[in-house]
Interface confidence: low
């Protein structure tokens, strides 16, 4: 049968097995979770994208699967990222009351995952899938991350990190969904700081990345919000992440592994 | 605290089937899954799969799929294994065994385990 | 399926001394900084016992003489000092994926 073809690459094989024993999974070691039933999960995860045109995906059509997700995270617990997911989920697993989006349950559903349906029929297209630049943006993946993340971003409280990767040539970047979704979806009502980790990638990088243009604009946009931004360098992401795991080590300095703070009003 | 308590042994003929029950106490049972494992004479130990009590989801081992079906009971508390079609290799003893972790789950309550001997 | 190689198949050792057994996958078992590794002991006609979690993290009521380390796709398990009652089986156990998979087991035995 004739499908459309797109540029990007087809739902992720197994993706209805997958999304099952992975809800299975969490529920199942989640003890707040465990009134989820996850066919009910999968059924609106489905619904949300099985025989829809998947260039024409609504942040609606996900509405009933957060509504079954509904998740909240304690003050001062939230870790955002951008473009360093690997370093923060490293992060999260060894300070465990900390959560980024992948460790709530509809982001560790979909994590790494592609997904996309057709126009009237009820297949799941594993062929191919609507590329955010050359096919469209509404498509079924971008939309889901766009509406979880705003969630997120929404009922998040107290002290806000952000987890930034310095080596990259924009720290900040406004096109990120961190600074078009997440940045824009802070509640100044409820958060009282973002403070931003800026992650440096060489060794003997001794640079404050803190005083980057990017990171300024950052701090511009949040102190428009009405949001204080306070940033910090993490010039050695491994000694950190040991420092976390063991905060007692003697080389462990006082602080987040000999970072320097910058306070912003 | 949590308990697993497993059916008494089996000796079963060669082509029938058996099932074994594991019956759970001192948690909700429909909050977590519970896995079988296998243990041949000899031969160390096999992941054969779990079930999902709160909605019966399964995932099995492909090994073992087609031949074991793992079912529950919720209000009973009991899980259940059956293994169809037995040969002489299926002569093992049969534990269940829940999770407990963190994110990712290991092996923290066991059944006694059930011995089946599958007759000629 | 990821295959687990423990050594040696047997240890024959005296109280009082150290057993360090050895576990390596076929592939790397890490994921976002954990090994997905775990160690079980048993002893005939019982369940196995967790030991150790996520490679090196020691089970409630485990003692101290019991230690796990490793990364990627090589694990161990040190026992030291021996006591009498630590003469058993010892699993390895990997659940990064599906199916998860147990070692052939090392047999650790009073000489």
């Known amino acids: 049968r004739w499908r459309q073809q797109w540029s990007g690459s087809g739902t992720t094989s197994r993706f209805p097995e997958t999304v099952l024993a992975r809800c299975v999974k969490y529920t199942e070691v989640h003890p707040e979770m465990r009134h989820v039933d996850c066919q009910s999960v999968w059924d609106a995860f489905k619904g949300a994208f099985i025989s829809k045109y998947p260039c024409n995906i609504t942040e609606e059509d996900y509405q009933p699967l957060v509504k079954l997700g509904t998740q909240t995270v304690p003050c001062n617990k939230t870790l955002l990222w951008s473009r360093i997911k690997d370093l923060a989920h490293q992060f999260t697993q060894v300070q465990r009351d900390m959560f980024t989006l992948e460790d709530m349950l509809l982001g560790y559903l979909a994590d790494d995952l592609t997904w996309c349906g057709e126009f009237n029929t009820f297949e799941i297209n594993y062929q191919s899938c609507p590329d955010w630049r050359k096919d469209c943006s509404n498509n079924p993946v971008s939309v889901f991350w766009k509406t979880v993340s705003r969630r997120f971003a929404e009922t998040a409280c107290g002290v806000v990190h952000v987890m930034l990767n310095g080596s990259r040539s924009k720290i900040f970047d406004k096109n990120s969904t961190f600074g078009s979704v997440e940045v824009h979806n802070l509640q100044p009502e409820k958060v009282q700081a973002l403070e931003a980790w800026v992650i440096h990638g060489g060794r003997e990088d001794s640079r404050d990345l803190c005083q980057d243009p990017t990171i300024k604009e950052l701090e511009s946009i949040i102190s428009k919000r009405n949001i204080r931004f306070f940033c910090k360098n993490i010039y050695r992401p491994d000694k950190f992440l040991q420092c976390v795991k063991n905060p007692e080590d003697s080389s462990c300095l006082s602080g987040i592994s000999a970072s320097h703070h910058h306070h912003h009003h | 605290q949590v308990q697993l308590v497993q059916s008494g042994a089996e000796v079963v003929k060669s082509g029938a089937s058996v099932k074994v029950s594991c019956k759970a106490s001192g948690y909700t049972f429909t909050s977590f899954n519970m896995h079988w494992v296998k243990e041949a004479p000899g031969q160390g130990l096999e992941w054969i799969g779990y079930i999902y009590p709160g909605n019966g989801g399964t995932n099995y081992n492909q090994k073992f799929q087609g031949r074991a079906t793992l079912t529950a009971d919720t209000s009973a508390s009991t899980a259940y294994m059956e293994i169809s079609s037995l040969r002489s290799e299926d002569t093992a003893v049969y534990f269940c065994a829940r999770t407990g972790g963190l994110r990712r789950a290991y092996f923290t309550y066991w059944g006694q385990g059930t011995l089946v001997t599958v007759s000629s | 399926d990821i295959v687990l190689t423990q050594s040696p198949a047997t240890l024959s050792l005296s109280p009082g001394e150290r057993a360090t057994i050895s576990c390596r996958a076929s592939e790397s078992v890490d994921s976002y900084g954990n090994g997905f590794m775990h160690w079980y002991q048993q002893k005939p006609g019982q369940p196995p016992r967790l030991l150790i979690y996520l490679a090196s993290s020691r089970a409630t009521g485990i003692p101290a003489r019991f230690s796990g380390s490793g990364s990627g796709t090589d694990f161990t398990l040190t026992i030291s000092p021996l006591e009498p009652e630590d003469f058993a089986v010892y699993y390895c156990?990997?659940?990064?994926?599906?199916?998860?998979?147990f070692g052939g087991g090392t047999k650790l035995e009073i000489k």
């Open positions: 156990q990997q659940n990064k994926e599906d199916p998860w998979t």
